[in-house]
Every structure is written in structure tokens, then in C-alpha cells.
Interface confidence: medium
């Protein structure tokens, strides 16, 4: 185009710029080793380093390991991006009691409203369930027969949440039936928002890949690279993705150029001790304790919660569709294997935290 000649001429003889025919404008030439954050950089701030996959470029221009959501009680909220760490939150059905940078150090199961109470605010990844006294008569907020009983004396606004044992504990929390994988799959559908850092104004090249040259002239596909298994953090540092190499872990989400890998316990197991983006200790998935049934929910922020069975009913903890409790989408592959010892249980009050001993038998957790 002849009309482009004046624009092209403005780049000529200026070693710090080049003319990009695709966008028909003069672009800033990123120095060797730096890569543009957009197709036609205009200034030095439009250039950055590259990191290995699972590392992100931090504020100090260093490649930093994205946190890992590999603990079984965590799910990825936002992915590891070139300029920001992955963010983890408690998995559906749990809330964070002890926060950590870009993650949660300790998750608890949402409380179940005791008899005579109904849910005022459902639990989220950040907050526990809030209960309120049931009004006389049937309330539309009643989620189950228990919640619609007449208020009894001495009811509390919130049942004691069930903790996931910290790394220092040898006991693991009795997990909720319904399948962590199902919950995580539901949650993963909500992880990346359209405006997440990794999807806005970034080159859409394959994660972790880079141009065949440090920065081909006129190319927009230039950014700081990280070694595989590292991702580019917000400050431009390569940050380590977690590894799912242990036999009891499987990869949930891959390590990307701008986000960490996430691991979860393999089918048939549940996480007893969480770790960022992974699980430090997986245990066989137990079945429900006697006198306990579960209420599966399929929303990311509302997972299965322990609940006393309605009067006159028998607990059925078999994760099968004919139960009437399990979601219709439950498939055989999502029916989790159970250690036979876990079924030899005694009745346990639902308000008490339940944990597994090293033998797989439930024990009461003193708190």
C-alpha cells in the first residue's frame, strides 16, 4: 500500500523499531531475550521475559513458581498466568479457615444446620454456612426435612465445621461421599473467567512454546520463556509447577506457560493432607459413617455436606444412582473404591468432626 510508505519510513533507520505489515504500523523492537506482550509493542514496558511452564513473571521480573492446588481439598480458582500465580480455593463443600498467599492453608467442611435451623446463607469457598432459626410452618428455604423441624431449645446458629487435618496430624477427616472428582470437575468449569490474566491481550500461542528465534522481526509471538514444568509468574519469573509423579496422584490440569499443573488424588482416594495445587497425603476413600447420609450438590461452591438422615430412614452410603441421592451423572468410573475397614463403623453424632485413624477406622476428632 503506497499510503503506508510514510509510516514505514518512520521506522527506517531506527534500530529500536520495525514495521509490522500485518498491523501496518511501527512497532518497538523488544531487546534480545525479551518478548512482546502484544502484537505490536509500542514501548519497553510492552516487553517481558519468558519463564518455564508453571512459573510466572513476578513484579521483580523473576520467574516464580505458581502455587499448586494439588491438595485434594483445593481447586484451581484462576490459572497460572504469565504474570500471576495460580489461585486456589477450598473445594466445593468446604470453606477456608486459614488463608495463605493465593491459596488456603486449612479448609473445613461446611456446617450442616442442626435441627430447628435452616440455611440463611449457603457456605462458599471463603465462608461457612450461616444458619438461622426456622420460622413456624414450612419455609421455602427448607432444603431437607431436618431443616424444617420445629426449633428445639438450645439450637446453635452454626454447627461445628469438620476440619481437614493439617499436615502435622496423622488422622484424616472423614470425607464426604459424592466424589471429589465430581466436585472438582464442576468447579473446574468455573475456573477461568473471560477476563482472567491469561486470556486478555496475550499472544494465543501454545503454552510453554516460544518462537523459533528469540524474537522474529514483526512477530507478536514473543515472550519470556520458562523451562517445561515452570510457568511465568506476574513478575516475570519462572515458577515451578507442582508434580503429580506420586503413584497416588493424577494430573487434574496440565502445567501451562502461565499456570501451574494441578494434581488430585487418584480415583478411589481422597486427600487427607492438602498441599498447594496438590495433595500431600491421599487415603482410600471411605464410605459414610453409620447414621450419616450425604446430600450431593453439583455447584462449585456447594458440595456434599454431612447431614443426619430423616427419621425412619436407613442410611445408604453406596454411591449408586438407585440410592436416589447421587447425581444422575454419576458413572461407574466415579464410584470410588472403599477400604473394607472403613465400613465397620459405629454411629457418630453428625455434629462431631469425624476422622480416620491409620487403620482406616473412623475416630472422633476432638477438634
Amino acid at each position: 500500500f503506497p499510503q503506508d510508505r510514510p509510516f514505514e519510513d518512520t521506522c527506517h533507520g531506527n534500530p529500536s523499531h520495525y514495521y509490522d505489515k500485518a498491523v501496518r504500523r511501527c512497532c518497538y523492537r523488544c531487546p534480545m531475550g525479551l518478548f512482546p506482550t502484544q502484537q505490536c509493542p509500542q514501548r519497553p514496558t510492552d516487553c517481558r521475559k519468558q519463564c518455564e511452564p508453571d512459573y510466572y513473571l513476578d513484579e521483580a521480573d523473576r520467574c516464580t513458581a505458581c502455587v499448586t492446588c494439588s491438595r485434594d481439598d483445593l481447586v484451581e480458582k484462576t490459572p497460572c498466568a504469565w504474570n500471576s500465580s495460580r489461585v486456589c480455593e477450598c473445594r466445593p463443600g468446604m470453606f477456608c479457615s486459614t488463608s495463605a498467599v493465593n491459596s488456603c492453608a486449612r479448609c473445613f467442611f461446611h456446617s450442616v444446620c442442626p435441627a430447628g435451623m435452616i440455611v440463611k446463607f449457603p457456605g462458599t469457598a471463603q465462608k461457612n454456612t450461616v444458619c438461622e432459626p426456622a420460622s413456624p410452618g414450612v419455609s421455602p428455604a427448607c432444603a431437607s426435612p431436618e431443616n424444617c423441624k420445629e426449633p428445639s431449645s438450645g439450637t446453635i446458629p452454626q454447627a461445628k465445621p469438620t476440619p481437614v487435618s493439617p499436615a502435622t496430624s496423622s488422622a484424616s477427616t472423614m470425607p464426604v461421599r459424592g466424589g471429589t472428582r465430581l466436585a472438582q470437575e464442576a468447579a473446574s468449569k468455573l475456573t477461568r473467567a473471560p477476563d482472567s490474566p491469561s486470556s486478555v491481550g496475550r499472544p494465543s500461542s501454545d503454552p510453554g512454546l516460544s518462537p523459533t528465534q528469540p524474537c522474529p522481526e514483526g512477530s507478536g509471538d514473543c515472550r519470556k520463556q520458562c523451562e517445561p514444568d515452570y510457568y511465568l509468574d506476574e513478575a516475570g519469573r519462572c515458577t515451578a509447577c507442582v508434580s503429580c509423579s506420586r503413584d497416588d496422584l493424577v494430573e487434574k490440569t496440565p502445567c501451562a506457560w502461565n499456570s501451574s499443573r494441578t494434581c488430585e488424588c487418584r480415583p478411589g482416594m481422597i486427600c487427607a493432607t492438602s498441599a498447594t495445587n496438590s495433595c500431600a497425603r491421599c487415603v482410600p476413600y471411605p464410605i459414610c459413617a453409620a447414621e450419616t447420609v450425604t446430600k450431593p450438590q453439583d455447584m462449585a461452591e456447594k458440595d456434599t455436606t454431612f447431614e443426619a438422615p430423616p427419621l425412619g430412614t436407613q442410611p445408604d452410603c453406596n454411591p449408586t444412582p438407585e440410592n436416589g441421592e447421587a447425581p444422575a451423572s454419576t458413572s461407574p468410573t466415579q464410584s470410588l473404591l472403599v477400604d473394607s475397614q472403613a465400613s465397620k463403623t459405629l454411629p457418630i453424632p453428625t455434629s462431631a468432626p469425624v476422622a480416620l485413624s491409620s487403620t482406616g477406622k473412623p475416630v472422633l476428632d476432638a477438634g
Epitope: Y55, D58, R62, A65, P214, R237, T239, A240
Partner: antibody, heavy 120, light 107 residues
Framework: QVQLQQSGAELAKPGASVKMSCKAS????????MHWVKQRPGQDLEWIGY????????DYNQKFKDKATLTADKSSSTAYMQLSSLTSEDSAVYYC?????????????WGQGTLVTVSA | DIVMTQSHKFMSTSVGDRVSITCKAS??????VAWYQQKPGQSPKLLIY???TRHTGVPDRFTGSGSGTDYSLTISSVQAEDLAVYYC?????????FGSGTKLEIK
């Protein structure tokens, strides 16, 4: 199995340059980034930088930016490190190392090291 | 840069003893810590990564632990062949940095 074979010892004069090699075998050379690590006698380890052999992308520890130059030759599956303007401080064993992606974050594979001695 | 400090240059132990080697990071490294064993005249050998994950083929007497800034490598029952220098390394952020090493001596 993964093997990293480094070139032999180098004796150099102050101000000179040396170029050492690290030949990779047992894996696809372009799939693994190559790291370089320095170890002075009786001292700790220092990360120099790394190169992505598939793209020749390099990133350096700021301390070694003007000292080391990393290159790679895909055809021979060999990574190189050149050290320039040598001083006695550069006398050390230099290792090439790589990771086992997806299963380890530390340096799982190391070359045997190249000893560089700078002496007048 | 992140500084990794190994406060003990030397540790003396006996065969069969349990020993813990410590490492402190100058800032939180989110468990992205590796441990290496280096015997005289040899290249370093990876033992542990992500603070507690044993590398392939590493005997289970080697255990890593820690979080935040404090990490340790424990040998549950020291063997004669464990005589070596042990280095911690943060693989959290570039530039990757190593501790100064702890030499394990057998009494």
C-alpha cells in the same frame, strides 16, 4: 537413560575465553531445557542460567550475564557454555544439568562436570 | 535473590542414628525446595524436590519436610554410604539458589 557428557578440563590464562560442551543422549534434546551450574572448590553451587535448545532462548542469573554465553546445537544434541574475560574467580567445576519434566523439579540429571582452571 | 541458609557446615553422626539437616530461605518459597547429595569427586544427586517428594530410586530413609521458610532433610537411619555434603536448593524462583551445604560426617 538420560546422560550428559561434558568436555574435558580446561586450563586458561586470565582474560582468555573457554567454551565447554555438554552432549546429551537418552532423550530428545530439544525437549529439555539445559541448566548450567558453577561450583568453586570447597564452595556451594551457583545457578548460571538455562537455554531452551528448541528455540535458543536463554535466561541468565544476573551475576553471570556478562560472563557466560549459552548456546545449543540441535544437530549434535550438544549444549555449550562460553566463559569470557576469565579471572581466578572463574576457576571452578561447571556442570550442565536438566530436569525430568512432569516428575521432578530439581535437577535430576547432571553432567560429570568440567573443571576450568584460570592461571597465569 | 532468595538466599538459602544452611546453618550447620558440619554434622557428626553415627551409623544407625537419625539426623536432620536444616535449611532456611530468606523468604517464603512455597515448599519449592530440593535436596541434593554430593559425594567427593561426584556430581550432585537429586534426593528430594517440592520439599518432601522423593526422587526416583532414593531410599526411603531420606525424608524431606517443611513449609514457608524452614525446611529439613531427615535421614532416619544413617548408613556409611550417606557420608556426603547435602545441599538445599529453592526451585521456586529464578535465579535458582542453593544453600552452602552441610557435610555429614560419620563418627
Amino acid at each position: 537413560q538420560v546422560q550428559l557428557q561434558q568436555s574435558g578440563a580446561e586450563l586458561a590464562k586470565p582474560g582468555a575465553s573457554v567454551k565447554m560442551s555438554c552432549k546429551a543422549s537418552g532423550y530428545t534434546f530439544t525437549s529439555y531445557w539445559m541448566h548450567w551450574v558453577k561450583q568453586r572448590p570447597g564452595q556451594d553451587l551457583e545457578w548460571i542460567g538455562y537455554i531452551n535448545p528448541s528455540t535458543d532462548y536463554t535466561d541468565y542469573n544476573q551475576k553471570f550475564k556478562d560472563k557466560a554465553t549459552l548456546t545449543a546445537d540441535k544437530s549434535s544434541s550438544t549444549a555449550y557454555m562460553q566463559l569470557s574475560s576469565l579471572t581466578s574467580e572463574d576457576s571452578a567445576v561447571y556442570y550442565c544439568a536438566t530436569r525430568h519434566y512432569g516428575s521432578s523439579y530439581g535437577f535430576a540429571y547432571w553432567g560429570q562436570g568440567t573443571l576450568v582452571t584460570v592461571s597465569a | 535473590d532468595i538466599v538459602m541458609t544452611q546453618s550447620h557446615k558440619f554434622m557428626s553422626t553415627s551409623v544407625g542414628d537419625r539426623v536432620s539437616i536444616t535449611c532456611k530461605a530468606s523468604q517464603d518459597v512455597s515448599t519449592a525446595v530440593a535436596w541434593y547429595q554430593q559425594k567427593p569427586g561426584q556430581s550432585p544427586k537429586l534426593l528430594i524436590y517440592w520439599a518432601s517428594t522423593r526422587h526416583t530410586g532414593v531410599p526411603d530413609r531420606f525424608t524431606g519436610s517443611g513449609s514457608g521458610t524452614d525446611y529439613s532433610l531427615t535421614i532416619s537411619s544413617v548408613q556409611a554410604e550417606d557420608l556426603a555434603v547435602y545441599y538445599c536448593q529453592q526451585h521456586y524462583r529464578t535465579p535458582f539458589t542453593f544453600g552452602s551445604g552441610t557435610k555429614l560426617e560419620i563418627k
